[in-house]
C-alpha cells in the first residue's frame, strides 16, 4: 500500500521559516503534488504549493521556494511574518496524486516540545484520504 | 507540452553585443530551470548558462564575465544578454527548460543561430 510522509522543521535561524518535506513511498509515477497548511487540500485548507514534473511549479505567499528533491519527494520552505506566519502546531499537508495508486495524502506538524532547528522525524503520516 | 521560442540572433562582430530572448508556452506554472545551450558547427550542444526560479545562475567558464543569463517579468521569460562576442561564440542558440529540475521532461526550443565575425 503506497504511504505519504511528512517532516515539519522549525528552522533554528529564523523561527518564522520553516521547512516541510514530504515523499512518497509507492511504485508509480507522481503526477501532482498540492502542499497545504491550516488542514488537507479542499478541506479548509490553503494551498501553498503545486509541483508538476512535467510542467513546473506553482507557489504562494508565505512559500518561499518548493523543489522536488527526487521524483517522489519534495521540499518547501515557508517564511512569513505577521498573519502570514506559520507558528509551531500549524499542520501541513501533502497530496501525491499517483498512476496507478490515486491520490494519497498525509499532514504532519512540528512536535509540541520540538526546540528550532529540530524536526519530527519523516515517518509515514496517517494517510487522511485516498482518492 | 512546454513549447520555447527563440529570437534574437544574428550577425555580429567581434567585440559585440546580442540579447537572446526565449518565450515560454508554460504561464501557471513556474519552469524550475531555465537556461541556454549551443551548439556549433560540428561539435556538439553545451552548456551555456542556466537559471532557476529562484535565482540561483551557473555559467560554463568560457562566457563568464561576458554573457548574463537572466529571467523576465513575465513568466517562464529567459533572456541571454551577450557581450564581448568572439568568433567561438558563432553557434545555434537554444533555450531549454526542466520544469522538475530532475530531467524527468526537458524541453527545447528550435534554435537561433549567432554568427561573430567581421
Known amino acids: 500500500t503506497p504511504e505519504v510522509w511528512v517532516q515539519v522543521r522549525m528552522e533554528a535561524t529564523e523561527l518564522s521559516s520553516f521547512t516541510i518535506r514530504c515523499g512518497f513511498l509507492g511504485s508509480g509515477s507522481i503526477s501532482l503534488v498540492t502542499v497545504s497548511w491550516g488542514g488537507p487540500n479542499g478541506a479548509g485548507g490553503t494551498t501553498l504549493a503545486v509541483l508538476h514534473p512535467e510542467r513546473g511549479i506553482r507557489q504562494w505567499a508565505p512559500a518561499r521556494q518548493a523543489r522536488w528533491e527526487t521524483q517522489s519527494s519534495i521540499s518547501l520552505i515557508l517564511e512569513g511574518s505577521g498573519a502570514s506566519s506559520p507558528c509551531a502546531n500549524t499542520t501541513f499537508c501533502c497530496k501525491f496524486a499517483s498512476f496507478p495508486e490515486g491520490s494519497w495524502e498525509a499532514c504532519g506538524s512540528l512536535p509540541p516540545s520540538s526546540d528550532p532547528g529540530l524536526s519530527a522525524p519523516p515517518t509515514p503520516a496517517p494517510i487522511l484520504r485516498a482518492d | 507540452e512546454v513549447q520555447l521560442v527563440e529570437s534574437g540572433g544574428g550577425l555580429v562582430q567581434p567585440g559585440g553585443s546580442l540579447r537572446l530572448s526565449c518565450a515560454a508556452s508554460?504561464?501557471?506554472?513556474?519552469?524550475?530551470?531555465m537556461g541556454w545551450y549551443r551548439q556549433a558547427p560540428g561539435k556538439d550542444r553545451e552548456l551555456v548558462a542556466t537559471?532557476?526560479?529562484?535565482?540561483?545562475?551557473k555559467y560554463v567558464d568560457s562566457v563568464k564575465g561576458r554573457f548574463t543569463i537572466s529571467r523576465g517579468d513575465a513568466k517562464n521569460s529567459l533572456y541571454l544578454q551577450m557581450n564581448s562576442l568572439r568568433a567561438e561564440d558563432t553557434a545555434v542558440y537554444f533555450c531549454?527548460?526542466?520544469?522538475?529540475?530532475?530531467?524527468?521532461?526537458?524541453?527545447w526550443g528550435q534554435g537561433t543561430m549567432v554568427t561573430v565575425s567581421s
Open positions: 508554460e504561464t501557471y506554472f513556474d519552469l524550475y530551470v
Open positions: 531549454n527548460a526542466d520544469p522538475s529540475g530532475l530531467g524527468r521532461k526537458v524541453y
Open positions: 537559471i532557476t526560479y529562484t535565482g540561483s545562475i
